[in-house]
């Protein structure tokens, strides 16, 4: 008959918690990869694509060895919230143009949201300081043209792909230290 009401739950194994977060991150990374392939196939666009509103990549090689769990989770959550906002914006602003990618974009948004909730849960289970609510971000301006929106889609998916690789690397390294 479980613990009495009001008593704290037995804390789960932090390595197992971290492991499940890594796996969810990797499955989101695979979704992102598949969607990027589709985007490149249907809307080819050479060269680098940048979007000033996207977060800058969190990590460099030297810093990876000195990572601390609170800073990784905090930064990852902030960056993924930004990407979630950008994916939502993309779906709204480019609905008709990106219709062929719509089911996958919707799935990506759902999984991104799920990963964010998992990160929040992990932070509370590990008793890490909770962040204050994010201040409302300024609205993203609609793309100037269909082509501008497609370039934005390339930038968003490319940045998300790289951010998720950084996240997996950081979390796996941290897991070995727990």
């Amino acid at each position: 008959p479980g613990p009495p009401p009001g008593s704290p739950r037995a804390s789960p194994d932090p390595r197992a918690e971290l492991d499940s977060t890594v796996l969810l991150t990797r499955s989101l990374l695979e979704d992102t990869r598949q969607l990027t392939i589709q985007l490149k196939d249907k809307f080819p666009a050479d060269g680098d694509h940048n979007l000033d509103s996207l977060p800058t990549l969190a990590m460099s090689a030297g810093a990876l060895g000195a990572l601390q769990l609170p800073s990784v989770l905090t930064r990852l959550r902030a960056d993924l919230l930004s990407y979630l906002r950008h994916v939502q914006w993309l779906r709204r602003a480019m609905g008709s143009s990106l219709k062929t990618l719509e089911p996958e974009l919707g799935t990506l948004q759902t999984r991104l949201d799920r990963l964010l909730r998992r990160l929040q849960l992990l932070m509370s289970r590990l008793a890490l300081p909770q962040l204050p609510p994010d201040p409302p971000a300024p609205p993203l301006a609609p793309p100037s043209s269909t082509w501008g929106g497609i370039r934005a889609a390339h930038a968003i998916l490319g940045g998300l792909h790289l951010t998720l690789d950084w996240a997996v690397r950081g979390l796996l390294l941290l897991k070995t230290r727990l």
Partner: antibody, heavy 119, light 111 residues
Framework: EVQLVQSGAEVKKPGASVKISCKAS????????MDWVKQAPGQRLEWIGD????????IYNQKFTGRATLTVDKSASTAYMELSSLRSEDTAVYYC????????????WGQGTTVTVSS | DIVLTQSPASLALSPGERATLSCRAS??????????IHWYQQKPGQAPRLLIY???NLESGVPARFSGSGSGTDFTLTISSLEEEDFATYYC?????????FGQGTKLEIK
């Protein structure tokens, strides 16, 4: 054509170091990780580690931590693996391989570099 | 580390026959909708070649006679009708955790 071309065979004495290069062409270097795999005679293939060219951040198999060093030269689209404190068990073919980000499967391989460690 | 065990160690078949190669993992390598098992072919003096990734996805340029299946701990590579060029050693590899590890291989020989 996507290609990985590795440096030539090496013969080294025990205790020495070896540095192998792997030149990538035919794809955007930063879009994939570069992994390194060892194949010793009669042994299983063994993953040494990988590096993300954009971040420059290597991850190592604990078995090779401290002896293997992975680096990249982005401007030359070239990855390097240095193995130090060589011993006879390091005699093997070493492959570089292109890896999907954070998935660790390898869709393009170099031709392999034979390293022989012998006194 | 996860240990992969391949069976049989060697298999002698004739061209045109069906080949079934098995790979068993010491713990589940499937989760969150993906199975982290990949299959490679290697011929003497050559580098391995990716055939199947994430358990069942055929790598670009690989003939459709190759297929992969399975989940959890048991996986299979099937070659529906063997061609002369298919006689080689086949390795499975997992990437569920770090480090990724490989099976010991199955050598497919001409009968």
């Amino acid at each position: 054509e996507v290609q990985l071309v590795q440096s030539g065979a090496e013969v080294k004495k025990p205790g020495a170091s070896v540095k192998i290069s792997c030149k990538a062409s035919g794809y955007t270097f930063r879009d994939y990780n570069m992994d390194w795999v060892k194949q010793a005679p009669g042994q299983r293939l063994e993953w040494i580690g990988d590096i993300n060219p954009t971040i420059g951040a290597p991850i190592y198999n604990q078995k090779f931590t401290g002896r293997a060093t992975l680096t990249v030269d982005k401007s030359a689209s070239t990855a390097y693996m240095e193995l130090s404190s060589l011993r006879s068990e390091d005699t093997a073919v070493y492959y570089c391989a292109r890896g999907e980000l954070a998935h660790w499967y390898f869709d393009v391989w170099g031709q392999g570099t034979t390293v022989t460690v012998s006194s | 580390d996860i240990v992969l065990t391949q069976s049989p160690a060697s298999l002698a078949l004739s061209p045109g026959e069906r080949a079934t190669l098995s790979c068993r993992a010491s713990k589940s390598v499937s989760t969150e909708g993906y199975s982290y098992i990949h299959w490679y072919q290697q011929k003497p003096g050559q580098a391995p070649r990716l055939l199947i990734y994430l358990a069942s996805n055929l790598e670009s340029g690989v003939p459709a006679r190759f297929s992969g299946s399975g989940s959890g701990t048991d996986f299979t590579l099937t070659i529906s009708s063997l061609e002369e060029e298919d006689f080689a050693t086949y390795y499975c590899q997992h990437s569920r955790d770090l480090p990724p590890t490989f099976g010991q291989g199955t050598k497919l020989e001409i009968k």
